[in-house]
């Protein structure tokens, strides 16, 4: 039976995808065939074949970026070390180990789901703009995050969430494969408005909130809070 595992990695980091036999196992590298591939597209990630040092079948996306340890394999550890994780690596990987002495029967089969994440930048909320006498427009921008974010606007006076019908979110997939988001909020003009923009990264369980205040043209920036309804000291910046 195939074992199933999950692992999380930050974009740009290195990650280990685990595929190992119980401790105390010993293997002869002239006997085992090890094959790592992606589960859906069957892209070849890396492999070990006895008396074969060339990895000519490895997909170019993984060449020199995916390695198994020969010393580890002797101990039954066929884990994959994947370097410089990218958003495109978010998929399921399958490790299959066969033994020639056992007639090429399956020794080990593991499917590892890799979840990739990247921190969004601290949101930037533009100063309010008045397209008409009775309307105010705010723009919130945050870039280079993963996966796709959720955006909330908050009434900072009572920490309530504003109706999502008032906002228009545009999410772009940038050249690095990361997400940039621009949210435009349109609300009725009132004498004093104290609002916040919150960017939520569900995978990292992280919310970045920045406030903007109208009335006396005061702008409040760089407030990063644990969730959309928490408050903090002015000018405090904290990661959740």
């Amino acid at each position: 039976d195939t074992q199933e595992k999950e692992v999380r990695a930050m974009v740009g980091s290195d990650v280990e995808l685990s595929c190992a036999c119980p401790e105390g196992s010993r293997f002869d590298l002239n006997d085992v065939y090890v094959y790592w591939q992606t589960s859906e597209s069957k892209t070849v990630v890396t492999y070990h074949i006895p008396q074969n040092s060339s990895l000519e079948n490895v997909d170019s996306r993984y060449r020199n970026r995916a390695l198994m340890s020969p010393a580890g394999m002797l101990r039954g550890d066929f884990s994959l070390r994947l370097f410089n994780v990218t958003p495109q690596d978010e998929q399921k990987f399958h490790c299959l180990v066969l033994s020639q002495s056992l007639g090429f029967q399956e020794v080990l089969s593991v499917e590892v789901t890799l979840h990739v994440a990247a921190n969004f930048s601290v949101p930037v909320v533009s100063a309010p703009h008045s397209p008409s006498q009775d309307e105010l427009t705010f723009t919130c921008t945050s870039i280079n995050g993963y996966p796709r974010p959720n955006v909330y606007w908050i009434n900072k006076t009572d920490n309530s969430l504003l109706d999502q019908a008032l906002q228009n979110d545009t999410v772009f997939l940038n050249m690095r494969g990361l997400y940039d988001v621009v949210s435009v909020l349109r609300i009725a003009r009132t004498p004093s408005v104290n609002i916040g923009c919150c960017i939520e990264n569900v995978l990292l369980q992280q919310n970045l909130t920045v406030g903007s205040q109208t009335g006396n043209d005061i702008g409040e920036r760089d407030k990063i809070t644990e969730n959309p309804v928490s408050t903090g000291e002015k000018n405090a910046a904290t990661w959740s």
Epitope: Y35, Q37, T38, S41, K42, T43, V44, N57, L96, L98, G103, F104, Q105, E106
Partner: nanobody
């Protein structure tokens, strides 16, 4: 029940050629979506993986057959082939096709290949 039926073996002189076929039948299993291999077993020796075609399309060969053997498939016929050229007496064995990994309950009778010098 999945069945693999090999054919195309025979007696051939050294330097000759043979083309082995393996038809997959039974429940809905597709050659296209399955990693398949050609194996061989000579008397008194352990089974060898001669040629492998992984489900992603990458192909690997035993060093001693590289440049001489070619594995291919016909998805429409649900059949996998092994074209064997420049045969030598060392290639004498029973040839089996099976999945990767080997599944004993899929195994056919194999097809005998004998190369005389």
């Amino acid at each position: 029940e999945v069945q693999l039926v090999e054919s195309g073996g025979g007696l051939v002189q050294a330097g000759g050629s043979l083309r082995l076929s393996c038809a997959l039948s039974g429940r809905a299993v597709s050659i296209a979506a399955t990693a398949m291999g050609w194996y061989r077993q000579a008397p008194g020796k352990q089974r060898e993986l001669v040629a492998a075609r992984w489900s992603g399309g990458s192909i690997q060969y035993l060093d001693s057959v590289k440049g001489r053997f070619t594995i291919s498939r016909d998805n429409a016929k649900n059949t996998v082939y092994l074209q064997m050229n420049s045969l030598t007496p060392e290639d004498t064995a029973v040839y089996y096709c099976n999945t990767l990994p080997w599944r004993a309950n899929y195994s056919g009778q194999g097809t005998q290949v004998t190369v005389s010098s």
